[in-house]
Interface confidence: low
């Protein structure tokens, strides 16, 4: 594949990454799949600067990110180490709350209306953010 050197149309560039901000809602798994089909992944927040950038663009709206604990420990979808990485949970979160009556706990992380993170039921139809890194190999065939 070719190296991507600029962001696709309707994506926003920031610090050598490209971001796409949805304006509709999907369950976490559907949002995850959407990003993958775009040769991207749900956003992985690795710094305070990236947190502020994303927060600025999404506004006060619940929005999925690429962090989940559906298989036990919390994991970022791109393999970034969770334990040593940046975190911005709300106080007392994540709490894997079972009291919502929807079955199971809360396994997917989202930005809340104030930007801090919360874990929630993965089936909720929240907005989402896709991210892809510039300079990584694209799956598209090179232009001849």
């Amino acid at each position: 594949g070719s190296e991507r050197t600029c962001c696709p149309v309707n994506w926003v560039e920031h610090e050598r990454s490209c971001y796409w901000f949805s304006r509709s809602g999907k369950a976490w798994a559907d949002a995850d799949n959407y990003c993958r089909l775009e040769d991207a992944h749900l956003v992985v927040v690795t710094s305070w600067e990236e947190q502020k950038f994303v927060q600025h663009h999404i506004g006060p709206v619940n929005t999925w990110m690429g962090l989940h604990d559906q298989n036990g420990p919390w994991k970022w979808v791109d393999g970034t180490d969770y334990e040593t990485g940046f975190k911005n949970w709300r106080p007392e979160q994540p709490d894997d709350w079972y009291g919502h009556g929807l079955g199971g706990g809360e396994d997917c992380a989202h930005f809340t209306d104030d930007g801090r993170w919360n874990d929630d039921v993965c089936q909720r139809p929240y907005r989402w953010v896709c991210e892809t890194e510039l300079d990584k190999a694209s799956q598209e065939p090179p232009l001849l």
Epitope: W48, H56, P60, K87, W89, P91, D114, G115
Partner: antibody, heavy 117, light 108 residues
């Protein structure tokens, strides 16, 4: 360089309402929580509460019934009101920015508020 | 509410010595949302350490933080004259945010 400048009445009578304002200079106002913290003379620090630029608030339960925080994003200012003050509310009041890992990374200069009849 | 207990209340040391300040929480401080501040008379507190072990901007590397769960430590490897002050720990792993009562570091 982000700086916080605060002001408000320094001398109050019991039962009056304390009112302080904090202005943010040289940096972003949105994307942060803004907090109020107080320190009685010779004592430790007590968190009063915080607010986000969208208007979300989070107060210390011990003061919640008397506290109101508000924000004016156009002026990059946030304010504290504490009603029905008593001598126990005498303290230096600080505004502060809630930064990375929920730590207070930038502080105002402090305002000494004395409640006395 | 998480209660933070700092010890010792007062620590008397000489410049050049090593200072070890302790902060113990009544419950786990989730994700190490614990910070350390220095305060000098008549001044606002200054952030030294956040996230239990990350030095704030402009803080000399003689200051270091460690710990997790309920036990946290601030270490000043080699005391300078300007380090004598009151030090506070603070947690926000659980609401409400709370501070320790402070440790006064004085010149011996």
């Amino acid at each position: 360089q982000v700086q916080l400048q605060q002001w408000g009445a320094g001398l109050l009578k019991p039962s009056e309402t304390l009112s302080l304002t904090c202005a943010v200079f040289g940096g972003s106002f949105s994307g942060h929580y803004w907090s109020w913290i107080r320190q009685p003379p010779g004592k430790g620090l007590e968190w009063i509460g915080e607010m986000y630029h969208f208007g979300n608030t989070n107060y210390n339960p011990s003061l919640k019934s008397r506290v109101t925080m508000s924000v004016d994003t156009s002026k990059k200012q946030f304010s504290l009101k504490l009603s029905s003050v008593t001598a126990a509310d005498t303290a230096v009041y600080y505004c502060a920015r809630v930064g990375q890992w929920l730590a207070f990374d930038i502080w105002g200069q402090g305002t000494m508020v004395t409640v006395s009849s | 509410e998480i209660v933070l207990t700092q010890s010792p209340g007062t620590l008397s040391l000489s410049p050049g010595e090593r200072a070890t300040l302790s902060c113990r929480a009544s419950q786990n401080v989730s994700y190490s949302y614990l910070a350390w501040y220095q305060q000098k008379p008549g001044q606002a507190p200054r952030l030294l350490i956040y996230g239990a072990s990350r030095r704030a901007t402009g803080i000399p590397d003689r200051f270091s933080g460690s710990g997790s769960g309920t036990d946290f430590t601030l270490t000043i490897s080699r005391l300078e004259p300007e380090d004598f002050a009151v030090y506070y720990c603070q947690q926000y792993g659980s609401s409400p945010c709370s501070f320790g009562q402070g440790t006064k570091l004085e010149i011996k």
